[in-house]
Structure formats: C-alpha cells, structure tokens
Interface confidence: low
C-alpha cells in the first residue's frame, strides 16, 4: 500500500514545537510529513478545533522525478501577535486515502511579566486623612504578588506580604508618591507613580463674631494642613436673592461672588460695604503651598436693619381754620431696613413739642382745638425702621390756607389714634 | 476560539432593573477580564466598567456608578450586568468584551419604554 | 477623564484611494511601563466593533496589511493605504493607559 495509508504508521517526521512568551510576541509552529503520490492539505488544529483562517504556508519538495516518488511536505503557522486567545494544544491534521493523521502536539502558552490591569492615580487629600489606593496585575504565570512603594520605600518585607490590591493609608502630613511593583516567575512590572498631594483640611466652625447694617465680622477655625503652613484664607460672599438661593453644599455660585483674602493667623475677617438687612451666603478655603483646600458649606448670615439714613421729603404744611394738612414722601436716602412707619412733631412759639406716630401713612389731618391763633407754628417728620428713627426734617412752618391756594390733591385723612390738642 | 454570547434584547418599564449576560468559551474563565461598553443608537462607546471574576473586583467609570453592578459566576462562566431604576436614557446596545476589545459579544439591546 | 478627539467626523472616499483618521488624546497616552495603549476599532453596519490595532500600530491578526496605526504621546494616525468596500464603518480610536478607558467620538468611513 502506498506510504501513509495504513492506520499505524504516521507520515509526519516532524511535530509542532512548543512556543512560550509574552504578549505581543511572533512566533512559528512547523510540522513536517513524507508522503508518497499526490502531497495533501495540511489543516491546523488548536484545542481539536481546525483553523479555519490560520495564517499557514505550505511547502512541497519532491524526492524523486516522478510524481508517485515520495514528497517532503513543510507546513509553518505564523502566530503573528501571541494573544491570549493564541494559547493552546497545537497539531497538523491531514487526510490520506480514507483516513486522517494527526501529528504529535505541541503548546503555546502566553507567560510573560506581570500586566497592569489598575495602577495607583495621582490625585489630591486633605492633611491626616485616610484614603485607599488600587492596583492590580496579572500573568501567566500566576501568581502576581504586589508590593507597595511610598516615596520608593518598600512597605512590605517582600512581595505578597502585606497589603495586595487595596492599600488603606490612614492619613499623610505632606504630599508623597506611591508605586506598586506586580512580581511573578518571570520578573517585575513597576506601575506608574502616583503623587498623592496633601492639601489643608477644611476650615471649621464659620461663625458670626459681629454684624453692623453695613459690616459682618466672621470667623473660622483652621484644619490641619500637614508640614505645611497655611499662606492665606479665602472667604467668598454671595447675595442670597431669593430666586436664586445657594444651596447648602452646593459647589459653586451660580452668579461671580465677592471673594476676599485674610492673611492668617488671625482666622477672622471683617466684611464691608455691605447692604443692611441683607441675607448673604459665606463660605471659606484655607490654602497652603500645595493648594487650596475644599470650601466649607455656605453659611447664612443676614446684616441687621439700619436707620434711614434721610428724612422724608417734599413735606407740605398748610392750616385751615382750626385743622392742619400735613404730607410728606418716603425719604430718597437708603431705608437700610423695612419702613415701620413715621413720627411727627410740632410745636408752637411757647408751647411745648407734641409726638406723634403717624404709621405707615404719608399724610395726616390736624384738628387744632381753640381758635387756631396759636403762632409760629412748625412741623418735623422722621421715618423709623425696627433699628430706630431716621433723621428728622428741618421744620416746616404751618401755612393759613387761602381761597384760591390749592388744596392738596391726595384724599386728606382725619388723625384718630390720637387725641385732639389745643393750645392755652 | 473565544466567544462571548450575550442575552436577548430587553424591553422594560421606567424605574425597573434588568440583569444582562455574557458567557464565555474558549479561553479560562478566570484569567482575563470582562468589560462593558453602551451605544446609544447613532451614537459611540461609552465604557461602563470591568469585572475580573477571579477576585469578583469590579472597577466602574464613574458616571455608571450606582446604574450598573458587574458580577461574574465562575461555575458557568457568565459575567452579569444589573442596571438600575431605568430610564429612557438607558435604552441602548450594551457589548461585552475582553479587557483590551480582541474579543466582543453581539450586543444586547435594551429598550426602555412605558 | 481623557478626552479622545477624532477627525474628521466623516470621511468619504472612492474605492482604491487612501484614506486617514486622526485621533488626538487631552492627556499623553505613553504609560509609565513605556507601552501606549491606543486602539483602533472598526464598527460595521449591525454588526459589533473589531479590534484592527493595538498597541498604537500593531496589527490584530486576519486585519489587511493596508492598514497602518501610528503616532505617539497624543497624537495618532489610522490609515488605510487603498480603501476597499469591506473597510465601510465607523472606526472608533480606544484609550486604556488612563482611567477610566475612554473612546473617541467615531469616523464614519463612507464610499463615494
């Protein structure tokens, strides 16, 4: 029978080899078969399975003249890029007469240094607080030990001693670095390093020392901020419009705040030119050489009602017989607060000063007992918030009222919270 | 060869959870990493996050944290992904992969409508 | 996260021409192990992405030699040296060196 058909003698004379290495490396696979008559396809197989789209070449050289001579057949995969979906039992599969041959295995495995699959980032902490850093390797070969680097110094005697994929560091006082180095049989991976910068703690305990219509004092107590020394603090204020309204926490304003620095120490700033009875919003950030650090919530606080800080205007007295129109306008200076109401004063030559509070009306009708003949008489007119009473006018001298002078426009109203007065 | 073989295609209400499957073959299971990518129609990859089932870490982008849980069963060699009080934002192709994107599943699609 | 801006958004092309796709990275790619982990990805109508490069030029293989990736730190290049009707798709440039992985937006290849 022709060479290679029967059962028990195998036509390869060469067999696969084993390839093992890293990602990324070319490698070949060769099988080499003698065969007499007409050379057959040589298949792949990996795993039992055949290579539909190996990357395979074949080469035939004959023995002889004549094309039943024998034949030496080389088949060669290329593995252009060891993947891991690469690795695996390797054979040649051809098919003679009525049956197929299968060439001894070989293998291919992917085995190289450790890789990466985490590594530590950079990123920023506050002074003496805990945080965690990852990182993760892998083989083949396993197993991938870790070991933790700070400032390039070893955390651990050896690798797979101490912490592996989490390290927990409890809190650091000035900025460092940290590395992880992946070790298995066939060497060491060192990860990129991470630099963890230390910034200042937050501020603590905003608070409100003082507050003036126009003026708020606050005050802070700093957080730790490591080896190094605070430079300065930043505080920021914002109005509280009530349609926008800061929330608490919420990372930044929503419109440009006013933003001031306070050297340090003292932890305290006085804030000016502000409006009186004004709700703000202030938060605080402490910064050192590394950075700043993160704000507080804003604060609430709110500057307390002022007095007006004028008095009203266009004020009009004219008498009649035996009653007096007094009206007046809100006054044109800043309220520094809400307009509780007005007082009114007047007073004859030798008579003493009359209080009254008008409330919240810019008019009021005198009734004046008597014959009226009471001389040189004079009005004043202030405005008060909750913190006190405005400036008073300057006196207005009560004019008699004469046919043809125009009466005042606005509907007069008669005074009754408070009793008639008369003159001796 | 490898293959990833994702679930069928999803339809849910607004605010339920659906768990989506990827099953591997050909290759060990526990060596490599499954990764999770979203497509919204028309538009590109977003990655969700990776599941190593050897340790069970999942490693997540932080837009999808509290959206997807990645989880992986060693037995059938299956990794899960549960997404969370869903909206019509979630509607989408959701892929499987390996670590690096040599190897993809189909794609599951998932539509979110009342 | 690591911005991926790839031009141009779409690109048409005539059979048997070259064509080229840019991608830029916010952040350099180079990581500390001297390895840049940059991918190209193809995505066929209805059909999931493939993988045709890694490792910024290497070819995955069965991937034409026509390709060809290269660049470095954030600057990289995919082009194919004679387009053929197989190569339509959007190709999406992948990032792996930072965390977490980020994709570029996507070049629709279209043929004239």
């Known amino acids: 029978a022709p060479r290679g058909t029967q059962a028990e003698e195998s036509p390869f004379v060469g067999n696969p080899g084993n390839i093992t290495g890293a990602r990324g490396l070319t490698g070949t696979l060769r099988c080499q078969l003698q065969v007499q008559g007409e050379p057959p396809e040589v298949h792949w197989l990996r795993d039992g399975q055949i290579l539909e789209l190996a990357d395979s070449t074949q080469t035939q050289v004959p023995l002889g003249e004549d094309e039943q001579d024998d034949w030496i057949v080389v088949s060669q995969l290329r593995i252009a890029s060891l993947q891991l979906s690469d690795a695996g039992q390797y054979q040649c599969l051809v098919f003679l007469g009525h049956q197929n041959f299968v060439s001894q295995p070989g293998y291919v495995g992917l085995e190289g240094l450790p890789y990466f699959l985490e590594e530590p980032e950079d990123r920023t902490v506050a002074a003496n607080t805990p945080f965690n850093l990852s990182c993760q390797a892998q083989g083949p070969p396993e197993p991938v030990d870790l070991l933790w680097l700070q400032d390039a110094v070893p955390l651990a005697t050896a690798p797979g001693h101490g912490p592996q994929r989490n390290l927990h560091v409890p809190g650091l006082n000035k900025t460092s670095s940290f590395s992880c180095e992946a070790h298995n049989a066939k060497g060491v991976t060192t990860s990129r390093t991470a630099t963890i910068t230390v910034l200042p703690q937050q501020p603590r305990n905003l608070h409100l020392v003082s507050r003036q219509p126009t003026e708020l004092e606050v005050a802070w107590t700093p957080g730790l901020s490591g080896i190094y020394p605070l430079t300065h603090c930043t505080l920021q204020a914002m109005l509280s419009d009530n349609e926008v309204g800061i929330q608490a926490g919420e990372p930044d304003p929503p419109e440009e705040p006013l933003t001031l620095q306070a050297s340090v120490p003292p932890h305290q700033l006085r804030l000016g030119s502000l409006h009186p009875h004004t709700p703000y919003h202030i938060r605080v950030a402490c910064t050192s050489s590394q950075g700043l650090s993160s704000w507080t919530h804003w604060l609430p606080v709110e500057t307390p009602e002022g007095v007006p800080l004028g008095p009203p205007e266009n004020i009009s007295a004219t008498r009649n017989g035996s009653q007096a129109f007094v009206h007046w306008q809100e006054p044109r200076a800043p309220l520094q607060g809400t307009l509780l109401g007005y007082r009114l004063a007047y007073q004859g030559q030798d008579t003493p000063e009359v209080l009254m509070d008008i409330g919240l009306r810019q008019e009021v009708t005198l009734e004046l007992q008597g014959d009226g003949s009471v001389s040189n008489l004079t009005v004043c007119v202030a405005a008060y918030t909750a913190a006190g009473d405005g400036p008073w006018s300057l006196p207005v001298p009560l004019e008699a009222w004469r046919p043809g002078q125009a009466q005042p426009v606005h509907q007069l109203v008669k005074e009754t919270s408070a009793p008639a007065f008369s003159w001796p | 060869q490898v293959q990833l073989q994702q679930s069928g295609a999803e339809l849910a209400r607004p605010g339920a959870s659906v768990k989506l499957s990827c099953k591997a073959s050909g290759y060990t299971f526990t060596s490599y990493g499954i990764s999770w990518v979203k497509q919204r129609t028309g538009q590109g990859l977003e990655w969700i996050g990776e599941i190593y089932p050897r340790s069970g870490n999942a490693y997540y982008n932080e837009k999808f944290k509290g959206k997807a849980t990645l989880t992986a069963d060693k037995s059938s060699s299956t990794a899960y992904m549960e997404l969370r009080s869903l909206t019509s934002e979630d509607s989408a192709v959701y892929f499987c992969?390996?670590?690096?994107?040599?190897?993809w599943g189909q794609g599951t699609t998932l539509t979110v409508s009342s | 996260d690591v911005v991926m801006t790839q031009t141009p958004l779409t690109l048409s092309v005539t059979i048997g021409q070259p064509a080229s796709i840019s991608c830029k990275s916010s952040?350099?790619?180079?990581?500390?192990?001297?390895?840049?982990?940059l991918n190209w990805l193809l995505q066929r109508p209805g059909q999931s992405p493939k993988r045709l490069i890694y490792l910024v030029s290497k070819l995955d293989s069965g991937v034409p030699d026509r390709f060809t990736g290269s660049g470095s730190g954030t600057d990289f290049t995919l082009k194919i040296s004679r387009v053929e009707a197989e190569d339509l798709g959007v190709y999406y440039c992948?990032?792996?060196?930072?965390?977490?992985?980020?994709f570029g937006g996507g070049t629709k290849l279209e043929i004239k």
């Open positions: 952040q350099s790619l180079l990581d500390s192990d001297g390895k840049t982990y």
């Open positions: 992948w990032q792996g060196t930072h965390f977490p992985q980020t």
């Open positions: 992969a390996s670590p690096l994107f040599d190897y």
